[in-house]
């Protein structure tokens, strides 16, 4: 028998791969901030809104300095999958009030999906261990009222906005170490 198969071939320039992922993340961050501002204009938020089903924010200023690439990409992918699911849920169950955020919510969903594919590609190009398939998530309960849908939208966009900023910073720091 021939030699055992080697590890997957690493991309010639991992910095370039990481760079295009950073740019996609930045675009999505800008879109999210704009959409969150639009939501706040239409439905002003009183205080912070939380949603128990959203991922816990993976950030602290100190933690940014200690990041490692596999951990960042795995965590980011898991969190963004959760946000994708929440955006889909919001579009489906958010009620007529949130229809005023279309087509922007649809664009956001498409860009989130694109970034997730990009992360998957980056992980395989960098020969990082692939995370196990995601267990099926329990379905999200529909909002109890129209205002509940709006509060959920504030929480989802606010959390995504923070997650993406953390991701951009983390990825940029990691790029300098490659």
């Amino acid at each position: 028998p021939g030699p055992p198969p080697g590890p997957p071939r690493v991309s010639p320039d991992p910095r370039a791969e990481l760079d295009s992922t950073v740019l996609l993340t930045r675009s999505l961050l800008a879109d999210t901030r704009q959409l969150a501002a639009q939501l706040r204009d239409k439905f002003p938020a009183d205080g912070d809104h939380n949603l128990d089903s959203l991922p816990t924010l993976a950030m602290s200023a100190g933690a940014l300095g200690a990041l490692q690439l596999p951990g960042v990409l795995t965590r980011l992918r898991a969190d963004l999958l959760s946000y994708l699911r929440h955006v889909q849920w919001l579009r489906r169950a958010g009620g007529s009030s949130l229809k005023t955020l279309e087509p922007e919510l649809g664009t956001l969903q498409a860009r989130l999906d694109r970034l997730l594919r990009r992360l998957q590609l980056l992980m395989s190009r960098l020969a990082l261990p692939q995370p196990p398939p995601d267990p099926p998530a329990p379905p999200l309960a529909p909002p109890s009222s129209a205002w509940g849908g709006i509060r959920a939208a504030h929480a989802i966009l606010g959390g995504l906005h923070l997650t993406l900023d953390w991701a951009v910073r983390g990825l940029l720091l990691l790029k300098t170490r490659l």
Partner: antibody, heavy 119, light 111 residues
């Protein structure tokens, strides 16, 4: 009205430190980064770094790592930049600016703080 | 770091005429989504003021006589018709990579 208010001029001795405040008003402080920019006399502008007021995440220009430290106090909507081990090279006007998340352009600028390093 | 070269370093334009300022980047600052180039105006003793962001978007409150264009490595700021109050130094800035950098500035004088 959206404003970034900075403190008055600072005259400091070589080797000393200085901490410059930048107080934001007229917008949601956590919606934007606060960036810091240096302008030496009659020269162009240099980006020092930025901070996200939500959780204090920072990014620095490699040139200013170890020279500048950025912090925020969310409760007072104030960002700070501390400059240490000052030399005559650090004599400049320092601006804080509101940075668009993810895009790094600066749509609102502070009044500027002149730092003069002299013995 | 990406180097931005502005030209000319200074120019004098008659009132009502067109002022054209160029900014060339040492590598492309454009992607499929955005061109990460921005323009500022600075008057003596004052902070810079954002005029144009992402190559061609006019900042709110900035007069329509200011316009930006370009992609890749070559960008232009146009002012037409030039007014007395436009006498200032103009800077380009990219944000394609970190650190963002600024051009050396172009001083506009009104004849």
């Amino acid at each position: 009205e959206v404003q970034l208010q900075q403190s008055g001029p600072e005259l400091v001795k070589p080797g000393a430190s200085v901490k410059i405040p930048c107080k934001a008003s007229g917008y949601t402080f956590t919606d934007y980064n606060i960036d810091w920019v240096k302008q030496s006399h009659g020269k162009s502008l240099e980006w020092i770094g930025d901070i996200n007021p939500n959780y204090g995440g920072t990014l620095y220009n490699q040139k200013f790592k170890g020279k500048a430290t950025l912090t925020v106090d969310k409760s007072s909507s104030t960002a700070y930049m501390e400059l240490r081990s000052l030399t005559s090279e650090d004599t400049a006007v320092y601006y804080c600016a509101r940075g668009e998340l993810g895009h790094w352009y600066f749509d609102v600028w502070g009044t500027g703080t002149t730092v003069t390093v002299s013995s | 770091d990406i180097v931005l070269t502005q030209s000319p370093a200074s120019l004098a334009v008659s009132l009502g005429q067109r002022a054209t300022i160029s900014c060339r980047a040492s590598k492309s600052v454009s992607t499929s989504d955005y061109s990460y180039m921005h323009w500022y105006q600075q008057k003596p003793g004052h902070p810079p003021k954002l005029l144009i962001y992402l190559a061609s978007n006019l900042e709110s409150g900035v007069p329509a006589r200011f316009s930006g264009s370009g992609s890749g490595t070559d960008f232009t700021l146009n002012i037409h018709p030039v007014e007395e109050e436009d006498a200032a130094t103009y800077f380009c800035q990219h944000s394609r990579d970190l650190p963002p950098t600024f051009g050396g500035g172009t001083k506009l004088e009104i004849k």
